[in-house]
């Protein structure tokens, strides 16, 4: 994760015994909630591995780093970080390994000055459409998110509700184009099948996306020609068979562009000529010297740029009439 | 409306153990949190434990922390609650819950079992 760590040593921990019997209050200036170890020069409150099943009611107002990770949370309700005054400081929060299976809509407002989210490994299988833009306004306000990183939030297959998760995570994505801001989004290991057609066009600034580690078969109907700023692109670890030169076109066409395609299911036929001519004129792609083919059997593991036409050849497809049974 | 059914209750020695069970009828999905509470005799019904269908989050009443355990089967549509270094003020009723919320009040639960019965006696 990209969320910022300490770098004070000076934490002091909060007696058990202050845990809620100030909860209603305004915190005091250099109060700790119970189970969270604070550092004010750091401007960081720990709240980690403590089994904690609600966000503490009494954190310091000068919080900017905030570590909730490893707890039992189960639910984020709407203003689950709202106080009086607001968390006015709070920047980077991170929620990753809570057992998180439910984000409301509205959780996060109230953070005027937060950049950088990170609810990875938490089994996300109710995600409010307006989790993350606060209201079911066509167009809300502005979120202050630059980073968003959503690894690993799938819910095991057994857990997952009827409902297409790709499209639950699109939808909290796109509310409102709240998130016109977002410069990084990362959402490595959710068993995507597929990218939702719209939902790059609909963030125009970003500049890293991490798809690592999913189960994308195609990009066909993904465009990227909207994202002149990307400098990142992570697509190791899908099932790609092919780019094809639309898709092809447009990553060339990306100034500050990297790709990282390595290990995918790459089909060494016909169709991939037009990719193999150009990994061998782009400078975009890191590593293209390790992609290799996996389809057909006779050409696994045949490294992709030693290839040539002679190489890729698709078998014929017979006419009925000449098909055996 | 989800069927509730515990069992496991019985007369046990402090000090001792009991696993209390569970069964829905159905994966209540619009339940996503089960819990226990317990009732003794001339007092409030009190929250227990409870565990998130999805997850599997578990909170737990400070009187049972370290000693009781609740845990789910998603595939049995089951919930369990481990209960040992049972002491006599454990003695109660027992009661399985179903409800939305992830909360120990009472109201946060709309579905309810009949209840078991846990006596800890010497």
């Known amino acids: 994760s990209s969320s910022p760590t300490s770098s004070a040593s000076s934490f002091s921990s909060s007696a058990p015994f202050l845990a809620s019997a100030v909860s209603a209050q305004p915190p005091l200036p250099d109060q700790c909630p119970a189970l969270c170890e604070c550092s004010e020069a750091a401007r960081t409150v720990k709240c980690v591995n403590r089994n904690l099943t609600e966000v503490p009611t009494d954190l310091p107002a000068y919080v900017r780093n905030l570590f909730l990770t490893g707890n039992q949370l189960a639910v984020l309700p709407a203003g689950a970080f709202a106080r009086r005054p607001p968390l006015a400081e709070l920047a980077a929060l991170n929620l990753s390994g809570s057992r998180l299976d439910e984000v409301r809509a509205g959780a996060f407002e109230h953070l005027p000055s937060l950049r950088q989210l990170d609810l990875s490994h938490n089994p996300l299988a109710d995600l409010s459409p307006f989790a993350f833009s606060g209201s079911n306004a066509s167009v809300s306000a502005p979120s202050p998110l630059v980073e968003l990183i959503l690894n690993h939030i799938v819910p095991p297959e057994d857990e997952r509700q009827n409902r297409s998760f790709e499209g639950m995570v699109v939808a909290a994505l796109l509310a409102g184009r709240a998130l016109q801001g977002l410069r990084r989004l990362e959402l490595a290991s959710n068993h995507f099948l597929y990218l939702p057609r719209d939902v790059l066009a609909q963030l125009p600034s970003l500049r890293h996306l991490d798809l690592s580690n999913n189960s994308l078969v195609s990009l066909t109907y993904v465009s990227f020609r909207n994202l002149t700023h990307l400098e990142s692109l992570h697509l190791e670890d899908n099932a790609l068979k092919v780019l094809h030169n639309g898709t092809l076109a447009e990553l060339q066409g990306l100034p500050h562009i990297r790709v990282f395609l390595d290990n995918n299911p790459w089909v060494c036929d016909c169709h991939m000529a037009d990719m193999v001519t150009w990994l061998k004129e782009t400078e975009v792609v890191q590593g293209k010297d390790r992609l290799t083919c996996a389809y057909p059997e006779k050409m696994r593991n045949r490294v992709l740029l030693e290839l040539n036409s002679a190489d890729l050849d698709c078998d014929p497809i017979l006419p009925p009439s000449l098909q055996t049974s | 409306e989800v069927q509730l059914v515990e069992s496991g209750g019985g007369e046990v020695q402090p000090g001792g153990s009991l696993r209390l069970s569970c069964a829905a009828s159905?994966?209540?999905?619009?339940?996503?949190?089960m819990a226990w509470f317990r009732q003794a005799p001339g007092k409030e019904r009190e929250f227990v434990a409870a565990?998130?269908?999805?997850?599997?989050?578990?909170r737990y009443a400070e009187s049972v922390k370290g000693r009781f355990t609740i845990s789910r089967d998603n595939a049995k549509n089951t919930v369990y609650l481990q209960m040992s270094s049972l002491r006599a003020e454990d003695t109660a009723v027992y009661y399985c819950?179903?409800?939305?919320?992830?909360?120990?009040?009472?109201?946060?639960?709309?579905?309810w079992g009949q209840g078991t019965l846990v006596t800890v006696k010497p």
């Open positions: 819950a179903a409800g939305q919320a992830w909360g120990t009040k009472f109201t946060d639960y709309s579905d």
């Open positions: 159905r994966r209540p999905f619009s339940s996503k949190t």
């Open positions: 565990v998130r269908w999805i997850g599997g989050a578990t």
